[in-house]
C-alpha cells in the first residue's frame, strides 16, 4: 500500500494508524477550515 501521512501527524501503513510525532502537512490544509497561507 502507498504510505502517506495523516492530518494530525499519522503515517498510514497498510491502513494501520501509527502516530508520526510532527504536524506533517500542516501547511497543506490538514486542519478542516483553517486558512493556510494567502490566496494562491
Amino acid at each position: 500500500d502507498a504510505e502517506f501521512r495523516h492530518d494530525s501527524g499519522y503515517e498510514v501503513h497498510h491502513q494501520k494508524l501509527v502516530f508520526f510525532a510532527e504536524d506533517v502537512g500542516s501547511n497543506k490544509g490538514a486542519i478542516i477550515g483553517l486558512m493556510v497561507g494567502g490566496v494562491v
Epitope: 502507498a2 494530525s8 494508524l17 504536524d23 486542519i31 486558512m35 493556510v36 490566496v39 494562491v40
Partner: antibody, heavy 112, light 111 residues
Framework: QVQLVQSGAEVKEPGASVKVSCTGS????????VHWLRQLPEKGLEWIGR????????IYTPKFQDKATLTVDTSTDTAYMELSSLRSEDTAVYYC?????WGQGTLVTVSS | DIVMTQSPLSNPVTPGEPASISCRSS???????????LYWYLQKPGQSPQLLIY???NLASGVPDRFSSSGSGTDFTLKISRVEAEDVGVYYC????????FGQGTKVEIK
C-alpha cells in the same frame, strides 16, 4: 471573491451513483488538501475523507472506504466525490473544504 | 473510533451574558508532542460550518476574542464571554488525533 462552488442538488434512486463537484473560484484547489464531509438531515457532521491534489493520495473514514471515491482534476481546479451504491441513509448535504474555504453544500437525496 | 460527546444539546442564552459548552472525548486528545487535537466549529443558520478554534486553544483567523477554549486531555469547554446575536447556531467539537470525528452538536439560541 474567493470561494468553492459545488454542483447542484441531486435526486437519485437507491443503488445508483452520484458525482459531486467542487470548483475553486479565485482559488487554486490543487495546492491544498480537499476534505469532504456530510451532514445528515437534522444531524451532525461526518468526515468522509480527504485528497492531496498534488499526488492523488487519499484517506477515508473506514465506513466510507467502499462508498466514496475522491478525485481531483487539476487542469480545471475541480475536486470530485463519487458515491456509489446509494441508499436512503446517504441522503445528506455534502461539503467540500480546502484551506479556509467551504463549499456551499450539495444536497443529495436518495429516494425511490 | 474516538467518540465526542457534547453537553448540553441545547443552550438558550441571553445576549451580553456568558455561555459555555462542554465536550468530552472517549480517549485523551493530548499527544506527547504537547498538542491537543481538539477543534471547535460553528454552523450558523443556513450556512456552511466555520472553524472557530484549532488544537484546543488557538483562535482561527477572524474569530472574535470573546471565544475561548480550554480543557484537559478528555474534557473541554468552549466559552463565550459575552454572547452576541450573531453567535447563534450549532457548535461542534471535533478531534483529529485519529482521523476526524465530531460531537453531535450544541444548538445555541437566544432566549
Amino acid at each position: 471573491q474567493v470561494q468553492l462552488v459545488q454542483s447542484g442538488a441531486e435526486v437519485k434512486e437507491p443503488g445508483a451513483s452520484v458525482k459531486v463537484s467542487c470548483t475553486g473560484s479565485g482559488f487554486n484547489i490543487h495546492v491544498y488538501y480537499v476534505h469532504w464531509l456530510r451532514q445528515l438531515p437534522e444531524k451532525g457532521l461526518e468526515w468522509i475523507g480527504r485528497i492531496d491534489p498534488e499526488n492523488g493520495e487519499t484517506i477515508y473514514t473506514p465506513k466510507f472506504q467502499d462508498k466514496a471515491t475522491l478525485t481531483v482534476d487539476t487542469s480545471t481546479d475541480t475536486a470530485y466525490m463519487e458515491l456509489s451504491s446509494l441508499r436512503s441513509e446517504d441522503t445528506a448535504v455534502y461539503y467540500c473544504v480546502s484551506s479556509g474555504y467551504w463549499g456551499q453544500g450539495t444536497l443529495v437525496t436518495v429516494s425511490s | 473510533d474516538i467518540v465526542m460527546t457534547q453537553s448540553p444539546l441545547s443552550n438558550p442564552v441571553t445576549p451580553g451574558e456568558p455561555a459555555s459548552i462542554s465536550c468530552r472525548s472517549s480517549k485523551s486528545l493530548l499527544h506527547r508532542n504537547g498538542k491537543t487535537y481538539l477543534y471547535w466549529y460553528l454552523q450558523k443558520p443556513g450556512q456552511s460550518p466555520q472553524l472557530l478554534i484549532y488544537q484546543m486553544d488557538n483562535l482561527a483567523s477572524g474569530v472574535p476574542d470573546r471565544f475561548s477554549s480550554s480543557g484537559s486531555g478528555t474534557d473541554f469547554t468552549l466559552k463565550i464571554s459575552r454572547v452576541e446575536a450573531e453567535d447563534v447556531g450549532v457548535y461542534y467539537c471535533a478531534q483529529n488525533l485519529e482521523l476526524w470525528t465530531f460531537g453531535q452538536g450544541t444548538k445555541v439560541e437566544i432566549k
